[in-house]
């Protein structure tokens, strides 16, 4: 299953990065799982994941650094609290969970660049 | 003449971006000209330029947004005062001016990403 995502995104100076993850569904899925993975060197770690029913909202866990909205075969993902050290390749993984058959789709990754802001001068 | 430069550089939150431009000199040049070009769409504009004698310092004009140092076949370039709208591809062009023959080298460009900082809160 094909998954498209932008090649590059810049995080805002507040450490927030948003991008769209779009998938070409081969079937009529009613339950979809979206996972954001971070690839550094050959290590792949899960950043966040959410399962949603088509037509319903995308809900991440309360302590997740991700939020998102879904519209058809598009998911708008936002990652918050990013620091310069979090700069890296963020991969969108989409799984069509129900009904069977299961389908896996993995994007090529979005390179997110993060620049730490300069601290504001102390107010005297 | 081959010119190497990094593919991507992030400007600091102060709008400063630095990168190295390295060239493989086919002769014993004594006078070298370095130009930074910005490519946006199909438009190429000159950002700054400096001519230097080998072994001497690299001197840009006083009102230039660029500064730099040279060491052998390497030039360390710094561009200041960058804003988010200045994000783009910055190409390093090197010309061996003297003695003849003249040689031209153009790098593949460095994608400089710039994020505007959040304004600091007013001090009451």
């Amino acid at each position: 299953m094909h998954v498209a995502q932008p090649a590059v995104v810049l995080a805002s100076s507040r450490g927030i990065a948003s991008f769209v993850c779009e998938y070409a569904s081969p079937g009529k899925a009613t339950e979809v799982r979206v996972t954001v993975l971070r690839q550094a060197d050959s290590q792949v770690t899960e950043v966040c994941a959410a399962t949603y029913m088509m037509g319903n909202e995308l809900t991440f866990l309360d302590d997740s650094i991700c939020t998102g909205t879904s519209s058809g075969n598009q998911v708008n993902l936002t990652i918050q609290g990013l620091r310069a050290m979090d700069t890296g390749l963020y991969i969108c993984k989409v799984e069509l969970m129900y009904p069977p058959p299961y389908y896996l789709g993995i994007g090529n990754g979005t390179q997110i660049y993060v620049i730490d802001p300069e601290p504001c001068p102390d107010s005297d | 003449m081959h010119v190497a430069q990094p593919a991507v550089v992030l400007a600091s939150s102060r709008g400063i971006a630095s990168f190295v431009c390295e060239y493989a000199s086919p002769g014993k040049a004594t006078e070298v000209r370095v130009t930074v070009l910005r490519q946006a769409d199909s438009q190429v504009t000159e950002v700054c330029a400096a001519t230097y004698m080998m072994g001497n310092e690299l001197t840009f004009l006083d009102d230039s947004i660029c500064t730099g140092t040279s060491s052998g076949n390497q030039v360390n370039l710094t561009i200041q005062g960058l804003r988010a709208m200045d994000t783009g591809l910055y190409i390093c062009k090197v010309e061996l001016m003297y003695p003849p023959p003249y040689y031209l080298g153009i790098g593949n460009g460095t994608q400089i990403y710039v994020i505007d900082p959040e304004p600091c809160p007013d001090s009451d």
């Epitope: 299953m1 899960e46 969970m97 299961y102 389908y103 896996l104 993995i106 | -």
Partner: antibody
């Protein structure tokens, strides 16, 4: 480090039942799908079943559909395979295997042998 | 349902030689979600290569994967004594998650 340990295999008569377990450690169990894969003596690998994440979504090979049930208890980091109406052709080493973040099976247990014989 | 065919069934080679194993799918494999596993007698399978050219952690660079669509290849550039084993391909892009019948690489 990641570890998967199967248990519950043994000799059972045709038509009887058996439950296999697979205890996982060294990773966040609920973040991974887990498969059962079997290998009959001297034969190749055959996919049996998979269970995903919170345990609601499952898939089975046609050869075991309606007879085998895969389940998991995320609080115990344990995967199960309930095998009913066993047949001689179910005789195999049963492996549990973890789904890697990018999809393949990156860690496998050592396997447990199930022999269906009268 | 995907049917995976592996060839040859057995490959007889000497240490130091190059091994080329083939895996062919009955239909195009989505996003090239194909993996290769190695299995030695009495042991569980071990992941070697996935999608279809990324090496798994700890796998030496003598192992490489290539291919797309329906035709995939596992290459062992220089066979070491420990490389003589069974090799399976598997598609993992959609259920059912089929395996190929395997190729045995044995010592000539």
């Amino acid at each position: 480090q990641v570890q998967l340990v199967e248990s519950g295999g043994g000799v059972v008569q045709p038509g009887r039942s058996l439950r296999l377990s697979c205890v996982a450690s060294g990773f966040i169990f609920s973040s991974h799908g887990i498969h059962w894969v079997r290998q009959a003596p001297g034969k190749g690998l055959e996919w049996v079943a998979v269970i995903w994440y919170d345990g609601r979504n499952k898939d089975y090979a046609d050869s075991v559909k309606g007879r085998f049930t895969i389940s998991r208890d995320n609080s115990k980091n344990t995967l199960y395979l309930q095998m009913n109406s066993l047949r001689a052709e179910d005789t195999a080493v049963y492996y549990c295997a973890r789904v890697a973040p990018l999809g393949p099976l990156d860690y496998w247990g050592q396997g447990t042998l199930v022999t269906v014989s009268s | 349902e995907f049917v995976l065919t592996q060839s040859p069934g057995t490959l007889s080679l000497s240490p130091g030689e190059r091994a080329t194993l083939s895996c062919r799918a009955s239909q195009s494999i989505s996003s090239n979600f194909l993996a290769w596993y190695q299995q030695k007698p009495g042991q569980a399978p071990r992941l070697l290569i996935y999608r279809p050219s990324s090496r798994a952690t700890g796998i030496p660079d003598s192992f490489s994967g290539s291919g797309s669509g329906t035709d995939f290849t596992l290459t062992i550039s220089r066979l070491e004594p420990e490389d003589f084993a069974l090799y399976y391909c598997q598609q993992y892009g959609t259920s059912p998650f089929t395996f190929g019948p395997g190729t045995k690489v044995d010592i000539k």
